[in-house]
Interface confidence: low
């Protein structure tokens, strides 16, 4: 049966009364329009609530904003407008929190039509002051902080100029004109490109891309004929129209621009596209659209230098530009990443891949749950899980798969059992060794969250009529207990709660209808009495990431070292606490075949841990473009996974030989690129 | 029965430069990472290099980077050791070492190198 | 760099003595440690790796222990060919992989 509040499921003793008395209830003095959360730091307690109403006259719309402010979790809020001077904030900008515990907020103000420009609202303490700055320009994006320094902030203006700010928005300076991408990069450093004829659009795949490293002072032409370009991890992509037709490649440079190679990539047309699904200081996994309007491409997996690619998965389902793709990193164990592809019968089917990218496989069937409609054999099928498409596609899922780093192996998803995703209504299944084994957990769509680092789940079925109802359990999902926060329904609008899963606070965002009015209202439940005491060294137990054989010597090795996990005993209603640190003992394999990506030019069929070589390329030198010289590859068809620590065992051999000769790479080689100085 | 002969040491000049070599037999050589060992007379042991079992990766401590090149040749069985600039520092005998991973099992005799005027 | 600090430096004892070396390091290495043993003139034999593995043809009365950042090297009941040098190394993460200082067991 599937798991609930059987005999079997130890009940939390005395718990409603333990909730009610930190049951916190703050209905907002607002009509109901939009509602923004946002929480200011780390640990710090203090979340803004931003509401809006928009009243629509006959000429114009007026609107009306107001400020909240908690410094408890969200269980008491006041009403700080007065501190923004009454301003109607721009809600499209949201709040632009600073990075880190800076303590720093930016408010973009909403100002009448004939204003030279825009007005700031800025706060350095956690929003207990704040400074209203006007701007010398009208802001076309929200402020954007540099990842080193919160004092740095740029914004685009509606005019296309590039805006830096070195004293946290007090002073602005236009750095650069004709620009419609700005970046942070590392060390204060902003990328941009620009245009020369007109506009943006006009001059897609004619931009050219500049660096600055000094906030505007001097300025590094670093690419040409660019249609746009990207960062991940330690990498930036460029994609570059070729010389003779309107085809694109993707460029890359590790070291912030200054030499540039060609990727291992197939080129893209006008209508296709390139996407960074996910990148690290390790790797890159890049989605590569297939020509037409076929809402699939495939996903290739980088060497270190981001600059030899392997097939990893075809037909992966990401639909056009900006659209929807399933990728999902399991953050909750290393390796671990899902997606959707698009089967030849237009079906989408789930698959997981635990290395990396380096192999894919069918989600294992719950064992706990039945095959659906979509199976052809009822007693084998698989686990296919819900996420942005499903969502896009209106079925009724109410969130995307959820896992935190904190709360090791625990995926929790929406999902159906059969040969395919299912448009029936999902149920919520859950994971507790980051996605090889699945059980159901929750009957139905539900919304949910993690507290505690995993100690508690919580969750609130997904309805369309009001409720009054939140589900946890203790047992990382395993049995549920019900508790009734509120007599009078409300109607459900949102879960919220810290970010980073250590919190034991969650607040219930839902409004009130009445005959004339609708008020936000919102719940907080601090589930500090129900783990009654902090975690002891007995409540936790050694569990092995990756095992899938334990007489195996090799069992839990990935990416080159298996780890050891102390990890909460299901059994155990305590405290992880706030100051939780994961603890984990990682030990180093010796190297297989399965520490090794196939080549360029090698591929690994289904079912085989050897690499093939491609027979288009058979009898070919393979030689490829780096730093703008021609290598020469010589492999027998294997390259080290980036990050895999393993040592010694089996280590085929690899070598790069320089031909001493040319690319033919139409971008800019270093010795042409040009700097200049304002 | 594994086994890994040095040979290649003597004297030099200070500035000056020599190559060390290693012949491994008993094993499959070019699926093992390899390492050279030094240790200076009456003193403990230094680790000097590491190369791959394909020979893309090199290591080497900072001190020693830029002066000591390691190589390997899996045809032939034979792992080197490049020295240049030569210092009296240098002295030591050279090991060489079979590095599986979490430790070097097995060992060369040493060759010793004495760098002087 | 992680840093290897091996005690006692030397150390006195008699055959059937039960003697403990041991190696703190500076950083946990999870443990990724080998312990070796060196004879005057002849070249390093590997004793134990990964902190608690006996090497192939290693007297059982050697065994290692530790984790995070203390290890040890335990000999029960020393035997005449035992005096000698021992040198532990840590293998965790990228190099430099140190050698501790030594330490020199000699006959009472």
């Known amino acids: 049966s599937a798991p609930g509040e059987d005999e079997e499921c130890g009940r939390v003793r005395d718990f409603v009364a333990k909730l009610a008395n930190n049951t916190h209830q703050h209905v907002f003095d607002d009509l109901r329009g939009s509602v923004s959360l946002s929480w200011v730091g780390d640990s710090t307690g203090v979340i803004l609530v931003l509401t809006t109403f928009h009243v629509p006259l006959v000429i114009m719309t007026f609107g009306q904003s107001k400020l909240y402010r908690s410094e408890d979790y969200g269980k008491n809020f006041k009403d700080i407008t007065d501190l923004i001077n009454n301003t109607f904030i721009r809600t499209e900008f949201g709040m632009a929190i600073g990075p880190e515990n800076s303590g720093k907020v930016v408010l973009t103000a909403e100002v009448s039509g004939g204003s030279r420009g825009g007005r700031i609202f800025r706060s350095s303490d956690f929003a207990k002051n704040f400074v209203q700055t006007d701007l010398p320009f009208h802001p076309l994006t929200q402020m954007m902080y540099s990842p080193q320094n919160s004092d740095y902030l740029l914004a685009l203006s509606t005019e296309n100029g590039l805006w830096v700010s070195k004293n946290f928005g007090g002073k602005w300076e236009e750095i650069h004109k004709a620009v419609c991408l700005a970046k942070w990069g590392s060390d204060n450093t902003i990328f941009f490109t620009t245009y020369a004829n007109g506009s943006c659009k006009a001059d897609l795949g004619a931009l050219e891309l500049w660096r600055t490293s000094d906030l505007g002072k001097s300025f590094k032409t670093i690419g040409v004929k660019i249609y746009s370009f990207g960062l991940g991890g330690r990498f930036l992509f460029a994609s570059v129209m070729a010389d003779k037709d309107t085809t694109r490649r993707i460029h890359v440079s590790t070291d912030q621009g200054d030499t540039w190679s060609m990727a291992q990539l197939p080129s893209v047309g006008q209508e296709q596209f390139y996407s960074i699904l996910a990148a690290n200081d390790d790797m890159v996994f890049m989605h590569v659209d297939e020509p037409g309007d076929t809402g699939f491409g495939t996903i290739f997996t980088s060497d270190d230098r981001g600059i030899v690619y392997s097939k990893s998965l075809d037909r992966h389902l990401y639909t056009t530009t900006g659209g929807e793709t399933d990728f999902t990193n399991v953050t909750s164990l290393r390796g671990v990443y899902i997606t959707s592809v698009l089967s030849e019968d237009n079906s989408i089917q789930t698959m997981i891949t635990f290395d990396q990218g380096g192999r894919w496989t069918h989600l294992r069937k719950p064992e706990n749950s039945e095959c659906d409609a979509t199976a052809k054999n009822k007693n084998e099928c698989s686990l296919h899980i819900h996420a942005s498409y499903s969502i896009s596609q209106k079925l009724n899922v109410p969130m995307a798969p959820l896992s935190e780093p904190n709360a090791v192996g625990i995926v929790i998803a929406h999902g159906s059992v059969g040969d395919a995703i299912s448009v029936m209504v999902p149920d919520v299944y859950i994971s507790d060794d980051g996605g090889y084994s699945w059980t159901k957990m929750l009957e139905g769509p539900h919304y949910y969250t993690i507290l505690d680092s995993g100690g508690i789940i919580v969750a609130i079925e997904h309805s369309s009529r009001p409720i009054n109802v939140i589900k946890f359990s203790t047992d990382e999902g395993q049995c549920w207990q019900t508790y009734t926060f509120t007599r009078d329904p409300i109607y459900f609008t949102g879960l919220a709660s810290e970010p980073g899963a250590r919190s034991m606070n969650i607040s219930i965002w839902g409004f009130t209808e009445s005959f004339l009015t609708s008020q936000w209202v919102s719940y907080t439940i601090d589930f500090k009495d129900i783990l009654e005491r902090n975690c002891e060294e007995k409540d936790y137990t050694i569990w092995l990431a990756h095992s899938t054989d334990p007489e195996d010597y090799e069992d839990g090795c990935i990416l080159g070292y298996k780890e050891q996990f102390l990890r909460l005993r299901k059994s155990s209603v305590c405290q992880n606490g706030r100051d939780y640190v994961v603890t984990k003992q990682p030990s180093i394999c010796l190297c297989s075949l399965e520490d090794f990506l196939c080549d360029f030019g090698y591929y690994r069929p289904e079912n085989d841990s050897k690499c093939v070589e491609q027979p288009e390329l058979k009898g070919h030198d393979l030689e490829f473009c780096l730093y703008g010289r021609e290598e020469h590859l010589t492999t027998n068809g294997y390259r080290k996974i980036p990050g895999d620590k393993c040592q010694g065992g089996v280590n085929p051999v690899r070598e790069v030989k320089d031909l001493k000769k040319k690319c033919t790479s139409n971008f800019l080689s270093p010795e042409k690129q040009n700097s200049k100085s304002n | 029965e594994v086994q890994l002969v040095e040979s290649g040491g003597g004297l030099v000049q200070p500035g000056g430069s020599l190559r060390l070599s290693c012949a491994a037999s008993?094993?499959?050589?070019?699926?093992?990472?390899m390492s050279w060992v030094r240790q200076a007379p009456g003193k403990g042991l230094e680790w000097v290099a590491t190369?791959?079992?394909?020979?893309?990766?090199?290591y080497y401590p900072d001190i020693l980077k830029g002066r000591f090149t390691i190589s390997r040749d899996n045809a032939k069985n034979s792992l080197y050791l490049q020295m240049n600039s030569g210092r009296a520092e240098d002295t030591a005998v050279y090991y060489c070492?079979?590095?599986?991973?979490?430790?070097?099992?097995?060992w060369g005799q040493g060759t010793l190198v004495t760098v002087s005027s | 760099d992680i840093q290897m600090t091996q005690s006692p430096s030397s150390l006195s004892a008699s055959v059937g003595d039960r003697v403990t070396i041991t190696c703190r390091v500076s950083?946990?290495?999870?443990?990724?440690l080998a312990w070796y043993q060196q004879k005057p003139g002849k070249a390093p034999k590997l004793l134990v790796y990964?902190?608690?593995n006996l090497a192939d043809g290693v007297p059982s009365r050697f065994s290692g222990s530790g984790s995070g950042t203390d290890y040890t090297l335990t000999i029960n009941s020393l035997q005449p060919e035992d005096f000698a040098t021992y040198y532990c190394?840590?293998?965790?993460?990228?190099?430099?992989?140190?050698f501790g200082q030594g330490t020199k067991l000699e006959i009472k």
């Open positions: 070492a079979r590095h599986p991973g979490g430790a070097m099992d097995y």
């Open positions: 008993g094993f499959t050589f070019n699926i093992y990472g």
């Open positions: 190369i791959s079992s394909g020979g893309i990766y090199t």
């Open positions: 950083e946990n290495i999870y443990s990724n």
């Open positions: 990964a902190a608690t």
């Open positions: 190394q840590h293998f965790w993460g990228t190099p430099p992989w140190t």
